[in-house]
Interface confidence: low
């Protein structure tokens, strides 16, 4: 008799794929543009990335450090009107892209939360949550919560408002903290809160350390849903050298939880390569004309246009991973088991019941390595086969679809492999 199928977990929309942050509308659109109407024209691009949600803004009125001149219910006219926003929401909905609004109050000022007027600000946030929920947004983000006094209790209250409106609405909190204890204390009192932090930014780019950070986090958070990113707002290139971007993309898309990216992460956008551009929000490189300041500074392979035409580009890898993440049960909600594979390597299995299973092997080092996969670390339900098919490599040159002998697995410097194998009873 066939074994009984495992019951599927309840899946919210943010469980099904990546979130894409556009913190600075002007930098994202470039060319002196940067409004909601223009963003509407970029939704097809977001669809091509197969992201599930767009984290937008802040876009509300905020006069730097002036609480009286900060209105969370009003869109800054530089970004457009309420009508433009409604139109964007409608278009996004048609493309199955959810819109999450960033309500970090004093986003133009020194302290994001006007530290001396916390109660006034908290009331403004409450009113704003109710207003924008009625307007049809799918969730909210608040950042820099380490600057918010009594953050846990405020977050719990805002979560109640959000979830009270609909279980299908999401609250994201962001912190600059990388300290696990601080992160856990924020999560403890807030069930279902999605928290972005700098926790992984301190991974030191080594396999062992990354493995220990990931497993510690998953063990500490138990069975609650996580998000994965390297910070609450910044680009991956702020933390990683270019050669590790592919590896981290593969990892973020295949860990259990919601991957969260910033605009430009998909092309390896790097402020350091664009003189004069701010680290936190460099101009998005749509094509070679996107950064006219220094002629010749931008080559085709740095842009969306150039990378779209190259199947071996970072953007092409992002699209493939995003596609896999959104349709494979084992990656959507499968169990996770990390195991030893040798120094410099981080490897894990994702599996769900009788569905196709995935093996991820990541070489963080700058030397080629043979992987010594220690299957003895794995429970019986997640045993390794002798061979697995190569779904993709982060490096060019491997024949995709070919079976690889796991005992003889060799990885190039900074190479990540995504392998698949069937369930065997």
């Amino acid at each position: 008799r066939a074994p009984r199928c495992r019951e599927l977990p309840a899946q919210k929309w943010w469980h099904t794929g990546a979130l894409y942050r556009i913190g600075d509308l002007q930098a994202f659109q470039g060319h002196g543009a940067g409004n909601l109407a223009g963003l509407k024209g970029r939704l097809d691009y977001l669809s091509s990335l197969k992201v599930k949600g767009l984290v937008l803004g802040p876009i509300h009125k905020n006069q730097k450090d002036d609480v009286a001149q900060t209105d969370l219910l009003q869109i800054d006219p530089n970004f457009g009107s309420k009508e433009d926003f409604d139109s964007l929401l409608q278009s996004a909905k048609k493309k199955s892209i959810r819109v999450i609004l960033d309500l970090t109050p004093n986003y133009r000022g020194e302290n994001s939360w006007f530290s001396t007027q916390v109660d006034t600000v908290a009331t403004k946030v409450k009113d704003a949550l109710e207003f924008w929920l009625q307007a049809g947004v799918d969730g909210f983000q608040v950042r820099d919560i380490e600057n918010l006094k009594d953050a846990s209790s405020f977050l719990a209250e805002w979560q109640n408002i959000t979830k009270g409106f609909s279980e299908d609405r999401l609250l994201i909190a962001g912190t600059n903290s990388s300290d696990l204890q601080q992160i856990l204390s924020l999560l403890e009192s807030n069930k279902d809160l999605l928290l972005t932090s700098s926790y992984l930014s301190d991974s030191g780019s080594t396999g062992e350390h990354t493995k220990s950070l990931v497993t510690q986090y998953l063990n500490a958070t138990g069975n609650r849903w996580c998000s994965w990113s390297l910070s609450q707002a910044r680009l991956l290139t702020s933390f990683l050298p270019a050669q590790l971007l592919r590896l981290y993309q593969l990892m973020l898309f295949t860990l259990p939880g919601t991957p969260v990216f910033s605009y430009g992460d998909e092309i390896g956008l790097d402020a350091a390569a664009l003189p004069g551009q701010p680290m936190e929000a460099p101009v998005m490189l749509w094509d070679e004309s996107s950064f006219p300041d220094i002629p010749g500074a931008v080559s085709a392979n740095m842009t969306v246009k150039g990378q779209s035409e190259d199947p071996g580009s970072l953007l092409s890898l992002f699209r493939r991973l995003s596609d896999q993440r959104s349709k494979e049960r084992s990656l959507l909600h499968g169990d996770f088991h990390a195991f030893s594979a040798g120094p410099g390597l981080f490897s894990y299995i994702r599996h769900w019941d009788q569905n196709e299973r995935f093996l991820v092997v990541l070489n963080f080092g700058d030397v080629g390595l043979s992987a010594g996969l220690q299957a003895s670390d794995l429970p019986a339900s997640a045993s390794l086969p002798a061979k697995a098919d190569l779904l993709l490599s982060t490096q060019p040159g491997r024949e995709e679809g070919s079976p690889l002998e796991l005992e003889r697995l060799k990885l190039e410097p900074h190479e990540g492999l995504l392998l698949r194998f069937p369930y065997a009873a």
Epitope: F239, P241, A242, Q243, A272, A273, M279, G365, D366, P413
Partner: antibody, heavy 114, light 107 residues
Framework: QVQLEESGPGLVATSQSLSITCTVS????????VHWVRQPQGKGLEWLGV???????IYNSGLMSRLSISKDNSKSQVFLKKNSLQTDDTAMYYC????????SSYAMDYWSQG | DIQMTQSPASLSASVGETVTITCRAS??????LTWYQQKPGKSPQLLVY???TLADGVPSRFSGSGSGTQYSLKINSLQPEDFGSYYC?????????FGGGTKLEIK
């Protein structure tokens, strides 16, 4: 092993141009950035600029107008050119490897003798 | 531009002692801090990168720590070969400025 070796004139007249060549071995300029740093006698280090593997150059904004960095990947050479020299440009000039495709990307891990 | 303030500017200590050199950045540099050692007449040598990772071949008596804007380099049980100048440098954004240096001399 990794080496960086400079060649150029020891002496340049005021208001003339300085050209220094840094020839590297043991690594490829398509994989690593090269930084330029200078140090006046008895003083501290000053970062001048960098040329990344993809050829993009970034300069110290205070010196940008008189500075240019270029390279020839095939010859494993990086060039520093500085126009209209003043007496306060007198210093030891170093080239150093940085942006290596490896764990020490955010550092200059090998330096020339200057 | 981020400014790096190093202290002390000079320091004299005896072999076997422990010394600490500090570096303060004018903005958050998120651990993108590097330490170098320079002996008279020689080029600088990498000691520590990303605030606390020891470069290859650097003795374990050296250690880096810190976060945000405050960083330090500690040398336990000073050896004769440790005397010279020490510089910090940030790699958060360009220009990648250096601290003013700390001259460590034998007492």
């Amino acid at each position: 092993q990794v080496q960086l070796e400079e060649s150029g004139p020891g002496l340049v007249a005021t208001s003339q141009s300085l050209s220094i060549t840094c020839t590297v071995s043991g690594f490829s300029l398509t994989n690593c950035g090269v930084h330029w740093v200078r140090q006046p006698q008895g003083k501290g280090l000053e970062w001048l600029g960098v040329i990344w593997p993809n050829g993009i150059t970034i300069y110290n904004s205070g010196l940008m107008s008189r500075l240019s960095i270029s390279k020839d990947n095939s010859k494993s050479q990086v060039f520093l050119k500085k126009n209209s020299l003043q007496t306060d440009d007198t210093a030891m000039y170093y080239c150093a490897r940085g942006g290596h495709y490896g764990s020490s990307s955010y550092a200059m891990d090998y330096w020339s003798q200057g | 531009d981020i400014q790096m303030t190093q202290s002390p500017a000079s320091l004299s200590a005896s072999v076997g002692e422990t010394v600490t050199i500090t570096c303060r950045a004018s903005g958050n540099i998120h651990n993108y801090l590097t330490w170098y050692q320079q002996k008279p007449g020689k080029s600088p040598q990498l000691l520590v990168y990303t605030a606390k990772t020891l470069a290859d071949g650097v003795p374990s008596r050296f250690s880096g720590s810190g976060s945000g804007t405050q960083y330090s380099l500690k040398i336990n049980s000073l050896q004769p070969e440790d005397f010279g100048s020490y510089y910090c440098q940030h790699f958060w954004n360009t220009p990648y400025t250096f601290g003013g240096g700390t001259k460590l001399e034998i007492k």
